[in-house]
């Protein structure tokens, strides 16, 4: 079993386009170009020489290392004289740099340079002038590199160019190779010998079907230049789910599981839960149990509460409040909240809609710890129905029918709603005649109208106020040429409602005998 | 894209000076050097010399010394050239075109759309 | 300083046809000369550097050849959009350009 060179790129080799990365995409440039040996090629080339600090990267496509622990880099390349090149004699360079950068999966088009281990700077044993450009000798520089030892699944290699004038004419990267074994759960692959008689080259090892490794403990071993494996260190551990079997990691058997690589050997299923199938990293929940999110695979499934018990109600004017008793049954958790649905129901065939967004609940309506809150802002008058659910970790993932207690009630008399449709029907100099619609929602016998106005110069400082049972009113002794601002509101034995938006209105000059509509300055929709 | 874009006709009177703008856009101004070439009605090209971007250096071909003078204004990525004492035979369409250097020889890969100087009494 | 000479000045081919345009120094060059194609009314182009690597966009029919002082340009086959005035320049410490070659329709 000889040692052998394994070949994992070879630039020259490819016919099509080598699509690597270059950043700035304005520096290295891919081109066809010709080998020592006239054969066309792919090649890299950069030579911007005229600016200082240039810092051009290009980088491979990712390499799979393969087998592979120690590699091998063959570059050849020409370089072009920097006193071939006009005028650029304080920015030109003769060398670039060789960088490497080990990832187990191609992380994409982003050069992130930090991360890149630089091998080597590169300078040409030889470079050409203007003169071999003309006979066409292209002074072809060969320079091998080494990396090594590599633990990761593979590598990008990265040339970066500080100013230099380049073509990279091939890329050779390869291997030697020891070969693979299974020691400790992990397959040890062919491998990368020594660089010298003596060394040993540490290896990573691969875990075996259906293992990982573990924790900061890399299964590893030596490869000796001889091509043997020595000194193992370090193991893989079986799956979740699997459990060890000489080299192998078997699935567990039913109704067993292993929720973590840790885990030496698999386990029975928690109480109310199972696994019908080999290799389970978790066992099912039987029917009506649920396992919560946060949950660990080790603990027993669990089912939502009963529903709360002894629910009763104390109702004022248009508030309620609600309290009750935990449930009977916890479903097995110590996680239960509670939330509140609320009905409006219609007086005659009992059907029921959700109450809306305008009610309040304090201090919540879900997520409730205490078991008690207060409803407030509900119609006057008006049947509700009020359902009470004891909620926990895994009430959301049951579909089942909900298990709550509920309460109706009919709430008393509410202040009346906002006065609407407030108009100016007539505007003289000294009075405005206005008219307006009685509210939505009178929530008991409107006694009388209250308007407010005062000169929109004061800004409500001081206002007068007038009272009228009919929907009408005029407004007398006001100054000619003022602007006015006025609001209307109900009142009931219940209380006053909420004063209407604002209406401007400005009187009529005194000069003016002739008589003309008022435009309303502005107007606004939220009431003072 | 990559652009140069040059001024539109100049018609001067011999004895008059002229400079043309050459605004550079979708490149970094200062990392490739910029040429001029001259090309008079129905002659060949001319190439009278290129200006190092970077430092502002120029270089002038034989026959274009002495009233030809290349200049930059990097802030605004502009060359210009300025010909002063205009004569008659200095008539011509004037290109400004950006210099590639490669590995294995150079170029100029980029071009301005020319300005034509017309130099008449 | 270098003079480039290009032949001939005016050469008819049919579209479909091979065009082989010359380009003579005066002395050995120190490199291999650029080629630029130049259409009426427009700016030249540049369709070859660095002795035989195409220019970004420029389509494989074009190719050079030549060292030391004979430097030829071929169309391999000639299209319609080819017709142009074409100009070898040498890029040593001075520029010069030959004084062209006319591609016109047979």
């Known amino acids: 079993q000889a040692a052998k060179e394994v070949l994992l790129l070879d630039s020259k080799a490819q016919q099509t386009e080598l699509e690597w990365i270059s950043s700035p995409p304005s520096g290295w440039e891919e081109i066809s170009g010709l080998d020592e040996n006239y054969t066309p090629i792919r090649t890299y080339q950069v030579c911007q020489v005229m600016e200082p600090n240039q810092n051009n990267w290009l980088r491979t496509n990712w390499i799979s290392k393969g087998n592979a622990q120690r590699i091998f880099v063959e570059l050849k390349f020409t370089l072009r004289d920097c006193n071939s090149l006009p005028g650029v004699l304080g920015t030109c360079k003769e060398t670039f740099n060789l960088y490497y950068y080990e990832t187990d999966y191609d992380t994409g088009r982003n050069i992130r340079e930090n991360l890149y281990v630089k091998i080597d700077t590169i300078a040409a044993d030889e470079s050409f002038t203007q003169g071999d450009l003309g006979e066409r000798k292209m002074k072809l520089n060969t320079e091998v590199r080494e990396i090594g030892p590599l633990s990761k699944k593979g590598f990008y290699l990265a040339f970066q160019d500080v100013g230099a004038c380049i073509a990279l004419v091939s890329v050779k990267v390869y291997y030697k190779k020891c070969w693979s074994i299974v020691e400790n759960l992990a397959v040890f692959p062919d491998t990368v010998t020594g660089s010298e008689f003596s060394s040993l080259v540490e290896v990573r090892g691969t875990c075996v079907s259906s293992a990982e490794e573990e924790a900061e403990n890399s299964p590893r071993m030596h490869c000796s230049a001889e091509g043997e494996w020595l000194v193992p260190i370090g193991k893989c551990i079986c799956k979740a789910g699997y459990q060890q079997k000489g080299d192998t990691c078997e699935p567990c058997g039913r109704r067993f599981y292993k929720s973590s690589s840790q885990d030496l050997q698999c386990s029975r299923c928690p109480t109310h839960s199972f696994s019908d199938r080999e290799g389970s990293s978790r066992c099912e929940c039987e029917d009506g149990y649920y396992r919560a999110p946060s949950d660990p695979p080790y603990v027993a499934c669990t089912r939502p509460p009963s529903a709360p018990q002894n629910l009763i109600f104390n109702i004022n004017q248009t508030t309620v409040s609600l309290e009750w008793s935990p449930p009977a049954d916890n479903g097995g958790r110590n996680d239960v909240t509670y939330r509140i649905l609320c009905k409006r129901c219609s007086w005659e065939q009992g059907e029921c809609v959700p109450c809306g967004s305008n009610i309040g609940y304090m201090p919540q309506q879900t997520g409730l710890e205490d078991n008690y809150v207060t409803v407030m802002d509900l119609l006057a008058h008006a049947n509700y129905t009020f359902e009470v659910e004891a909620v926990n970790g895994v009430s959301d993932l049951s579909r089942s029918q909900r298990l709550f207690a509920a309460v109706s009630i009919t709430t008393g008399q509410a202040a009346p709603s906002q006065v609407s449709g407030v108009m100016k029907e007539r505007v003289l100099q000294r009075s405005v005649q206005l008219s307006w619609q009685e509210p939505e929602h009178p929530n008991g016998v409107i006694t009388e109208y209250e308007i407010k106005y005062y000169e929109k110069d004061q800004r409500e400082r001081t206002y007068s106020t007038l009272k009228t049972k009919s929907t009408s009113a005029s407004i007398n002794n006001l100054k000619p040429g003022t602007v006015y601002v006025f609001q209307i509101r109900a009142v009931t034995a219940a209380g006053y409602g909420n004063y209407s938006p604002r209406l401007d209105v400005a009187t009529l000059e005194e000069a003016s005998g002739k008589m003309f509509e008022a435009t309303a300055v502005s107007s606004e929709q939220n009431p003072v | 894209q990559v652009q140069l874009l040059q001024s539109g006709a100049e018609v001067k009177k011999p004895g008059a000076s002229v400079k043309v703008p050459c605004k550079a856009s979708g490149y970094t101004f200062t990392s490739r050097a910029m040429s001029w070439v001259r090309q008079a009605p129905g002659q060949g090209l001319e190439w009278m010399g290129w200006?190092?971007?970077?430092?502002?250096?120029?270089t002038y071909a034989q026959g274009f010394t002495g009233r030809f003078v290349f200049s930059l204004d990097t802030s605004v990525s502009t060359a210009y050239l300025q010909i002063s004492s205009l004569k008659a035979e200095d008539t011509a369409v004037y290109y400004c075109a950006r210099v590639r250097f490669t590995v294995y020889g150079d170029g100029m890969d980029v071009w301005g759309q020319g300005t034509l100087v017309t130099v008449s009494s | 300083e270098i003079v480039l000479t290009q032949s001939p000045a005016t050469l008819s081919v049919s579209p479909g046809e091979r065009a082989t345009l010359s380009c003579r120094a005066s002395q050995s060059v120190s490199s291999n000369p650029a080629w630029y194609q130049q259409k009426p009314g427009q700016a030249p182009r540049l369709l070859i550097y660095g002795a035989s690597t195409r220019a970004t966009g420029i389509p494989d029919r074009f190719s050079a050849s030549g060292s030391g002082t004979d430097f030829t340009l071929t169309i391999s086959r000639v299209e319609p959009e080819d017709f142009a005035v074409y100009y070898c320049q040498q890029y040593g410490p001075s520029w010069t350009f030959g004084q062209g070659t006319k591609v016109e329709i047979k």
């Open positions: 200006i190092n971007t970077n430092t502002g250096n120029p």
